[in-house]
């Protein structure tokens, strides 16, 4: 007996790791046996070379060759997402549409977010080598190498957190050249080599000498970003100071720094960072768009000298280095609601003054943009006709608009009755795909 098509096996999300073809499965029942066609982001696929897709007789889709690891177009950020694939099974009694399956490709960018820096540590004290691995998909794992060999991590003495290496108690044998290595299925990347010097603690019989040291912090200068640290490095400053008093009793110098609070406000706690220098040194890990106070403190072993004077420096704002998160589109009564969550705080690069929202061309909205001022994280757009509505959102600081979110789309059906929401075992679909062809 004749029956309409029904999807029995839906395609599954997968990561293309190559070098062989990726396969997307789709099986359907129906009488007469249905014909299968595949769509990518709602558009039918050609399957004829030079198309990178090939259809097998059983309805399986072969992706013969992915794009070069990660792809970008129209000036957008590198993407790992090849798109959402759906299959359609059709016979003369109707058409069934599968759930969408997202295909992504393994990527590992070149640029480290934070490169490890040369440093001086003291025997018995803890020190940290910072490393922010390059962005990658899947998330890269981080390992450390010392003097060209993998570092054997000793529990209780070594901890790797977020890529950074924390050494609980420095020993003379820890001296050497360290490198951070990020690895995922797309390959591996090596950081710059950082030189770690270990000094013996010096016990002064008269630590009172340290109290007589006077430190004049003379300059705090914003450094030009190191190109090796990639396109969005955290800011670093160069501190210069002069020491007077007893003959060089200080064994090391520590920078103390904090963000400046509003006048009369409770001061923020001072952060401390051991400096690799005796008259000048680099201090990193700061944030754009902040006003900082800096001072320097001398120390010898456990003894500390008096703090220097305080210098202020305003770091300029930059555009946000991450897009707004969780962008969603929801249908309203003759309107579409766009909502989002601000980018992570560490990517603000200043004060977020508002948001820019774009509608993309070739959908039911003409290309347009709106500015949302202040802390508001939603926008209502009037709609006049059914069709696809696609938007992108970017956060704005005093330096301009930052990285835009990936396009998010919503299909409004006839008479604005409802938005197409394809059920799945994971609840409704994310609204990231254009589903103009998913009408029953």
């Amino acid at each position: 007996q004749d029956s309409p098509p029904q999807i029995l096996v839906h395609p599954q999300d997968q990561l293309f790791q190559g070098p062989g073809p990726a396969r997307m499965s789709c099986q359907a029942s129906g009488q007469p046996p249905p014909t299968i066609r595949w769509l990518l982001n709602g558009q039918p696929l050609s399957m004829v070379p030079p198309d990178p897709h090939h259809l097998l007789p059983d309805g399986t889709l072969l992706l013969l060759q992915p794009p070069a690891r990660g792809h970008a177009h129209d000036g957008q950020a590198l993407s790992t997402d090849l798109g959402v694939y759906t299959c359609e099974a059709s016979n003369r009694l109707g058409t069934a549409v599968s759930r969408g399956a997202r295909l992504s490709v393994a990527v590992l960018r070149e640029d480290f977010q934070i490169q490890p820096r040369d440093m001086v540590a003291v025997v018995g004290e803890q020190f940290t080598l910072e490393c922010g691995p390059p962005w990658g998909h899947p998330e890269p794992t981080v390992s450390w190498w010392k003097d060209g060999k993998p570092l054997a991590l000793q529990p209780g003495r070594h901890t790797v957190s977020g890529g950074s290496l924390l050494m609980a108690r420095a020993e003379k044998s820890d001296e050497g050249t360290y490198m951070c290595v990020a690895t995922n299925s797309a390959g591996h990347r090596e950081s710059r080599a950082a030189r770690v010097s270990i000094q013996e603690p010096q016990d002064y019989t008269e630590p009172v000498e340290l109290l007589a040291v006077r430190i004049q912090l003379e300059n705090v200068t914003l450094l030009n970003p190191d190109p090796a640290e990639g396109p969005k490095p955290r800011p670093a400053v160069w501190l210069s100071w002069k020491v007077s008093g007893p003959a060089a009793p200080a064994q090391s110098y520590t920078a103390l720094f904090r963000t400046q609070t509003a006048p009369g406000g409770q001061g923020a706690p001072w952060a401390e960072e051991l400096l690799a220098g005796w008259q000048s040194a680099e201090l990193g890990g700061l944030h754009w768009g902040q006003d900082y106070e800096f001072k320097v403190r001398p120390s010898s072993g456990r003894a500390r000298g008096p703090d220097s004077n305080v210098l202020l420096l305003r770091l300029p704002e930059k555009v946000p280095s991450a897009p707004p998160q969780e962008v969603t589109l929801k249908p309203g009564n003759g309107t579409v609601f766009v909502s989002w969550v601000p980018p992570p705080a560490e990517n603000h690069n200043g004060i977020i003054r508002g948001y820019q929202v774009w509608s993309l061309g070739n959908t039911s909205l003409p290309p347009a943009n709106w500015t949302v001022v202040g802390e508001q994280t939603q926008l209502e757009i009037a709609t006049h006709m059914p069709g696809s509505y696609c938007v992108q959102v970017a956060a704005v600081t005093g330096a301009g608009a930052g990285e835009p979110s990936r396009p998010v789309c919503l299909l409004l059906e006839q008479a604005m009755e409802r938005a197409t929401q394809e059920p799945s075992e994971h609840g409704p679909w994310t609204l990231e795909q254009l589903r103009a062809t998913l009408k029953r």
Epitope: L40, P49, P50, D51
Partner: antibody
Framework: EVQLVESGGGLVQPGGSLRLSCAAS????????ISWVRQAPGKGLEWVST????????NYADSVKGRFTISADTSKNTAYLQMNSLRAEDTAVYYC????????????????WGQGTLVTVSS | DIQMTQSPSSLSASVGDRVTITCRAS??????LAWYQQKPGKAPKLLIY???SRASGVPSRFSGSGSGTDFTLTISSLQPEDFATYYC?????????FGQGTKVEIK
Amino acid sequence: EVQLVESGGGLVQPGGSLRLSCAASGYTFSSYWISWVRQAPGKGLEWVSTIYGYDGSTNYADSVKGRFTISADTSKNTAYLQMNSLRAEDTAVYYCARMSYNWSSPGHGMDVWGQGTLVTVSS
Amino acid sequence: DIQMTQSPSSLSASVGDRVTITCRASQSISSYLAWYQQKPGKAPKLLIYGASSRASGVPSRFSGSGSGTDFTLTISSLQPEDFATYYCQQSWSYPLTFGQGTKVEIK
């Protein structure tokens, strides 16, 4: 910098042969299709042939089938168009172009073009 | 073979004008359509592929739309450097075919 450079054009008599070369640099040659496209003087663009650097798959326009042969040497990152039995109507500027696939909205574009090489078939 | 028909074959416009060129395929080609710009004596330059995605480095005043058989290239505000000939091309099936071209001239 991604670049394609054609060479080998010139004046040839009807019935004669020429071999055009297209040297690619700045990208992974085997990951892309290369097309030859020609343009007769004062006319529009006409696709001639395509080859896939990865596996050597080829396709031809009916107007050149049996007379032209496309090939590639991946070790030299170079594509070739061997043109035999040339006719007056083959006179044109011949371009080689790299074909890229767009993933957000499926389809191809010839995103990198050579400067073109003129082939004149005349007695 | 899939025939690609462009209209108009030529048009005159002024700097700042909004210009629309259409391309019709003789059968459905999904989004497998590209647009090129060509200036005299130069190789063509890719503007749009996948019907609506701008190629790298192409100004945002160029946009493409359409799917199936009917496609449009729009230049939102014509600039002096935009006077050229524009071609559409399908890659849905062999033979790959181009439209006959649209020449955009200064009024």
